[in-house]
Interface confidence: medium
């Protein structure tokens, strides 16, 4: 629908407050350095904008796009060279292009200090003393740290924040109550932001027609029920939103959510019989319940996938009638028959079908040609199966820690050009799909793993992305959506690597690290791992074992001694000694 | 190079009968929809059925079912559009068009073929 | 009467750019972006000049651009020139074992 001010109908549809709070999420995401108040202060500029337009859709300049409102109100920030650089060139372009300038210059991994949480005294004291600016801060902080974050649905938790601080704060523990909440809803968040990053970069680097068959498959399995029609529909509304929202068209992006949360629930008859109780709830806890919902059970008696995509002489025929349509049926069908299966699996056989069929097709005997394409599946659904079996025994053998290391060496030998912190940060994630999936039966376990490791592996290729190092990494990063796992899994050690040469200041610890969490102290020690394998490559799993084991004993020995910075001193550089003698440096 | 080329333009009676072709060429005929498409004086354009090749499958629109019958031969790579009785409001302008998918893609259309009919 | 509708006559000045909507389009259609244009002059077959809403076929010019929004695609037209004066027809697919549907086609005046 046409309407005269798109600022006012945003403003109108989703109320002042979501306006406020996605017009600040917006800011953040493009102007990552910017200070809070000075965001906080254009925020206040473009609501009392919206609210003239309101009053009069006609006024001056209430016609105007909001790309044009909002990328004129983020240029008069007056640092923008000096803060950003050439980010400010994107200010002398026109819309369209000045809002895809912005949205190029979004960094994943920002210059910005680790959030530190204050004592639960000071944070509560902090809101009580302002609610709304402690809340507007929180969305200000990730949304900055976070700029592909999923706006509508960071309000849902900017909600449980803020709930969860009006319940904690009144109780008698304060910390035991609320310390755990945000843990909770800071791993939620952090899982939530690499998920819609996903969803992003399959739009950005892929295009549509990828997320398409991504979301296809995806609610096929959720919605088993669903015909084909009501699919494609959801499938459409739903990558609209999130092309807005990767776009930073965040009011329409959520003003559009709304309004599938809506059509769903209005239609959940013809959609799953498991959207009752989220259909229930208010609208921000009503999209994510929708988004995360259990998938329906399978309609009884499917007939054979064969008899319509293999068997049927109508096969080429309905093919050249309408390809991604039939295409688009195929994994439909597929994927509400396979909810054991991983998303990435199914457009992988998927892939396979339609390139089967572009061949046979025109061959001379069409169906001779694909009668044994299913034949071709089986090699495509065992490898994820062998692989997941193999690294839950793994897992099941080492537990989370070890586990996360056996990946840090094997992908550090991988690509060792990657820094440091990415390897750590990958590895640790990658590690976490044990915990996170091995524990599942069978028929949940792929769908767990190899989708959670499509998160992962895109975190690697955006962070490397932005400094590129590895050809290697590009080539499984660009080449193909689905393949990616498949990619990095096949990569062998890089014999081209010369090793690093060896800085005893790397290996050189102080008694700080006593202090640190668990967590930190791990982090730590899988620091060392990664630049142990860069120094020598070539090193055993039993001689990295060793070193990390001494490792291990020299710190708990130092943290117990009386004077634990002469202990780091002294016995470090008899380690550091040791480490070279066993490792050959 | 792909090429659609069809018949000549034909001048009837009302109730005559009448098959106009459409000869395909430089692609594989049997693989692809072939579509027809009716253009009465001054008008729009409109879609009256289609035909693939390989099978003979045929698909009308709503207004053309039992008007018209669209038929193809494989072997000599060309598709027809035939009346069995010709009216006054048949007179129009009639095209072919290949179909890349009957997602109303014509890629490749021919010369088309003027149907004139009057008594 | 067709399914899709389009406006009877667009105008437009030489360099300035028209856009022409084609609504109607069925869901099915909407969701694989099953939408073509063609561009006709007098007494000539009709040629392709958008397809899957968006995509042009090799050798038509940049200046023609597709989108959708909604159940409605639009045909942007822009640096109006003499020669784009002609007729411009949607064509959208109607759904499996169906066959797909015009819009009444739109003139194109260029002033």
């Known amino acids: 629908d046409a309407h005269k001010s798109e600022v006012a109908h945003r403003f109108k549809d989703l109320g002042e407050e979501n306006f406020k709070a996605l017009v600040l999420i917006a800011f953040a995401q493009y102007l990552q350095q910017c200070p809070f108040e000075d965001h906080v202060k254009l925020v206040n500029e473009v609501t009392e904008f919206a609210k003239t337009c309101v009053a009069d859709e006609s006024a001056e300049n209430c016609d105007k796009s909001l790309h044009t409102l909002f990328g004129d109100k983020l240029c008069t920030v007056a640092t923008l060279r000096e803060t950003y650089g050439e980010m400010a060139d994107c200010c002398a372009k026109q819309e369209p292009e000045r809002n895809e300038c912005f949205l190029q210059h979004k960094d994943d991994n920002p210059n910005l200090p680790r959030l530190v949480r204050p004592e639960v005294d000071v944070m509560c004291t902090a809101f009580h003393d302002n609610e709304e600016t402690f809340l507007k801060k929180y969305l200000y902080e990730i949304a900055r740290r976070h700029p592909y974050f999923y706006a509508p649905e960071l309000l849902f938790f900017a909600k449980r924040y803020k709930a969860a601080f009006t319940e904690c704060c009144q109780a008698a523990d304060k910390a035991a109550c609320l310390l755990p909440k945000l843990d909770e809803l800071r791993d939620e968040g952090k899982a939530s932001s690499a998920k819609q990053r996903l969803k992003c970069a399959s739009l950005q680097k892929f295009g549509e027609r990828a997320f398409k068959a991504w979301a296809v498959a995806r609610l096929s399995q959720r919605f088993p029920k669903a015909e084909f029609a009501e699919v494609s529909k959801l499938v459409t509304d739903l990558t609209k939103v999130h092309t807005e929202c990767c776009h930073g068209d965040l009011l329409e992006c959520a003003d559009d959510r709304a309004d599938l949360a809506k059509y769903i629930c209005e239609n959940q008859d013809s959609i799953s019989s498991k959207l009752k109780e989220c259909c229930e709830k208010p609208l921000l806890e009503k999209s994510h319940c929708i988004a995360e919902v259990e998938n329906d059970e399978m309609p009884a008696d499917l007939p054979s996938l064969a008899a319509d995509f293999v068997e049927s002489k109508d096969v080429c025929k309905n093919y050249a009638e309408a390809k991604d349509v039939f295409l688009g049926m195929f994994l439909y069908e597929y994927a509400r028959r396979h909810p054991d299966y991983s998303v990435v699996l199914l457009l992988r056989l998927a892939k396979t079908y339609e390139t089967t069929l572009e061949k046979c097709c025109a061959a001379a005997d069409p169906h001779e040609c694909y009668a044994k394409v299913f034949d071709e599946f089986k090699p495509l659904v065992e490898e994820p199966q062998n692989l997941i079996k193999q690294n839950c025994e793994l897992f099941e053998q080492l537990g989370e820690y070890k586990f996360q290391n056996a990946l840090l060496v094997r992908y550090t030998k991988k690509v060792p050009q990657v820094s440091t912190p990415t390897l750590v940060e990958v590895s640790r994630n990658l590690g976490k799909v044990g915990s996170k999936c091995c524990k599942h039966p069978e028929a949940k376990r792929m769908p767990c793993a190899e989708d959670y490791l499509s998160v992962v592996l895109n975190q690697l290729c955006v962070l490397h992305e932005k400094t590129p190092v590895s050809d290697r990494v590009t080539k499984c990063c660009t080449e193909s959506l689905v393949n990616r796992r498949p990619c990095f899994s096949a990569l062998e050690v890089d014999e081209t690597y010369v090793p690093k040469e060896f800085n005893a200041e790397t290996f050189t610890f102080h008694a700080d690290i006593c202090t640190l969490s668990e967590k930190e102290r791990q982090i730590k020690k899988q620091t060392a791992l990664v630049e142990l394998v860069k120094h020598k490559p070539k090193a055993t799993k039993e001689q990295l074992k060793a070193v990390m084991d001494d490792f291990a004993a020299f710190v708990e020995k130092c943290c117990k001694a009386d004077d634990k910075e002469t202990c780091f001193a002294e016995e470090g550089k008899k380690l550091v000694a040791a480490s070279q003698a066993a490792l050959g440096l | 190079e792909v090429q659609l080329v069809q018949s000549g333009a034909e001048v009837k009676k009302p109730g005559e009968s009448l098959k106009i072709s459409c000869k395909g060429s430089g692609y594989s005929f049997t693989n692809y929809w072939i579509g027809w498409v009716r253009q009465m004086p001054g008008e729009g354009l409109e879609w009256m059925g289609i035909?693939?090749?390989?099978?003979?499958?045929?698909r009308y629109s709503p207004s053309f079912e039992g008007q018209v019958t669209i038929s193809a031969d494989k072997s000599i790579s060309t598709a027809y559009l035939q009346w069995s009785s010709l009216k006054a409001s048949d007179t129009a302008m009639y095209y072919c068009?290949?179909?890349?998918?009957?997602?109303?893609?014509?890629?490749?259309w021919g010369q088309g073929t003027l149907v004139t009919v009057s008594s | 009467q067709s399914a899709l509708t389009q406006p009877a006559s667009v105008s437009g000045s030489p360099g300035q750019s028209i856009t022409i909507s084609c609504s109607g389009i069925?869901?099915?259609?909407?969701?694989?972006?099953?939408v073509s244009w063609y561009q006709q002059y007098p007494g000539k077959a009709p040629k392709l000049i958008i397809y899957?809403?968006?995509k042009r076929p090799s050798g038509v010019s940049n200046r023609f651009s597709g989108s959708k929004s909604g159940n409605t695609a639009s045909l942007t037209i822009s640096g109006l020139q003499a020669d784009d004066e002609a007729e411009y027809s949607c064509s959208s697919y109607a759904g499996r074992n169906a066959v797909a549907v015009f819009g009444g086609g739109t003139q194109l005046t260029v002033l």
């Open positions: 035909i693939y090749p390989g099978d003979s499958d045929t």
């Open positions: 068009a290949r179909l890349h998918g009957v997602v109303s893609r014509g890629d490749y």
């Open positions: 899957e809403v968006t």
């Open positions: 069925s869901s099915l259609a909407g969701s694989y972006n099953l």
